[in-house]
Amino acid sequence: LVPHLGDREKRDSVCPQGKYIHPQNNSICCTKCHKGTYLYNDCPGPGQDTDCRECESGSFTASENHLRHCLSCSKCRKEMGQVEISSCTVDRDTVCGCRKNQYRHYWSENLFQCFNCSLCLNGTVHLSCQEKQNTVCTCHAGFFLRENECVSCSNCKKSLECTKLCLPQIENVKGTEDSGTT
């Protein structure tokens, strides 16, 4: 089975690498534009230059192309705590990231939010905080992990998952409550 190709891919595959087929004349292969530029006019004939123009400020192309317009530069999302790591240039999009001691949580493929790395108070660091993953904490005895923080077992209700981890403490509390004063 031949994999289905889009019209653009079909047209490009007829020409050697680095060239594309002229949209009005499929016997002509035009040279693609370099990154940082876009297609202003197709080449007039075989062996003749494609008219490529540099991207304007606020736009870019990151690879060789025959795009009629450059792509708009991304903006870092302040509301998500993002900061600009490197600004947009004609051949590279803006790079956004997080501040020191923060990690990225991806809500979707193209949306991330910056959160502070957990400090593992009342526990120990099992795995250090990384660019895309929070610190992994191991809690001390008498504490359980809730929303990546070590919380005292005194806050563990019977209905919660923590009962397994806090079982001895819960038994002790129950024992204390049950024992009457003599």
Epitope: E79, M80, H105, E147
Partner: nanobody, 119 residues
Framework: EVQLLESGGGLIQPGGSLRLSCAAS????????MVWVRQAPGKGLEWVSH????????YYADSVKGRFTISRDNSKNTLYLQMNSLRAEDTAVYYC????????????RGQGTLVTVSS
Amino acid sequence: EVQLLESGGGLIQPGGSLRLSCAASGFTFAHETMVWVRQAPGKGLEWVSHIDRVGQDTYYADSVKGRFTISRDNSKNTLYLQMNSLRAEDTAVYYCAQLPKRGPWFDYRGQGTLVTVSS
């Protein structure tokens, strides 16, 4: 106490429109970035859209871009989601929420409103 109450869901035919509302109370609404998320039957939560405090910066998931519009009225403490050209795959419970601050979970989220797109 933070309260978020969604309304406006219902049964709608493909191609139709709905406007969801979320009435907020118990916090300073104008200080919070607000989010719409949805949960389709048997699926996880999907981030649909968010809007910053002043309504200037918005974000849309690729699946709803060009069809949904998020807005807010800070004087009425209300968040909106205008949904046009609805598709069967938009069927879900829609929740409004405050943008999480401490970690990737929703401390404050409404009870949700069900949107069913079916002919």
